[in-house]
């Protein structure tokens, strides 16, 4: 799998996922999350070749079409698999709300 | 929605589905399929900006810091989101066989 | 159900100056992502400006000749556009992006026109 686990311990070239660390105040402006100060989102990148991680019959057949046909533009692309959610303390007024903001830390990447 | 109503009928810049048809045999290299001889796989294509179509709280967040990093090389990815079966006739031996290919055709595209 | 009011659309001649304002529910707009989007006929909607807390961002298009600014205490945003084009002529619109919340997700103002001709 396209995962942490395997990605962050090698040096893949092909799609797979990546370290990004946001900081909500430096890189979105959000002042309003008082914790945490930022989050390990991570993001997907890297070519889609055929038979790497391909995420349906489309995305074979695609990826086939482009080792057969290298200069088009039709080409699979490295995006999220697996998701996970990430919880925020912000306050509304005084008091202080924990929520859960879904789909927010990418753990694998897929070529779809 | 961005699906081939829209996206043939424009000159869209942004995500979008394009259209791609795809020769069995010449692009494939594919002589087992009898019928049909090819077919509209279309692709996906174009920009994901903040809020063009996106699929997730991930995928928003990543187009804000995208925007706000124009240089980072973390962006939502355009992707197919609704795809269809095609329909093919090969034979095994000489008995013809009727098949549905599931997920090989793109109708509509999103931002991942 | 979070409410988007955009206002200030008008007709202005080129070179000229229009201020827009967009007030969204009071409940929600300290913690929105705040943007101006506009769509010129026979075209797709584009981005124009979005005020992200204290972070701005602007279309190459309008850089330089438009502003962007929030008021949290008057729950408004604001986009001042200075020496208007006739390109600039379009239907703008404001969105509100909530993150967080029961009233989480994308909410729409309905558009104010701006014609800039002489």
């Known amino acids: 799998a396209l995962d942490t686990n395997y990605c962050f311990s090698s040096t893949e070239k092909n799609c797979c996922v990546r370290q990004l660390y946001i900081d909500f105040r430096k890189d979105l402006g959000w002042k309003w999350i008082h914790e945490p100060k930022g989050y390990h989102a991570n993001f997907c990148l890297g070519p889609c070749p055929y038979i790497w991680s391909l995420d349906t019959q489309y995305s074979k057949v695609l990826a086939l079409y482009n080792q057969h046909n290298p200069g088009a533009s039709a080409a699979p692309c490295c995006v999220p698999q697996a998701l996970e959610p990430l919880p925020i303390v912000y306050y509304v007024g005084r008091k202080p709300k924990v929520e859960q903001l879904s789909n927010m830390i990418v753990r694998s990447c897929k070529c779809s | 929605a961005l699906d081939t109503n829209y996206c043939f009928s424009s000159t869209e810049k942004n995500c979008c589905v394009r259209q791609l048809y795809i020769d069995f045999r010449k692009d494939l290299g594919w002589k087992w399929i009898h019928e049909p001889k090819g077919y509209h796989a279309n692709f996906c294509l174009g920009p994901c900006p903040y809020i063009w179509s996106l699929d997730t709280q991930y995928s928003k967040v990543l187009a804000l810091y995208n925007q706000h990093n124009p240089g980072a090389s973390a962006a939502p990815c355009c992707v197919p989101q609704a795809l269809e079966p095609l329909p093919i006739v090969y034979y095994v031996g000489r008995k013809p066989k009727v098949e549905q290919l599931s997920n090989m055709i793109v109708r509509s595209c999103k931002c991942s | 159900e979070v409410q988007v009011v955009e206002s200030g659309g008008g007709l202005v001649q080129p070179g000229g100056s229009l201020r827009l304002s967009c007030a969204a529910s009071?409940?929600?707009?300290?913690?929105?992502?705040m943007g101006w989007f506009r769509q010129a006929p026979g075209k797709q909607r584009e981005l124009v400006a979005i005020?992200?807390?204290?972070?701005?961002t602007y279309a190459d298009s309008v850089k330089g000749r438009f502003t962007i600014s929030r008021d949290n205490a008057k729950n408004t945003v604001y986009l001042q556009m200075d020496t208007l084009k006739p390109e600039d002529t379009a239907v703008y619109f404001c969105?509100?992006?909530?993150?967080?919340?029961?009233?989480?997700?994308?909410?729409w103002g309905q558009g104010t026109q701006v014609t800039v001709s002489s």
């Open positions: 969105n509100a992006y909530v993150p967080v919340g029961e009233s989480r997700g994308d909410y």
């Open positions: 009071a409940s929600v707009f300290s913690w929105s992502v």
């Open positions: 005020s992200s807390g204290d972070r701005e």
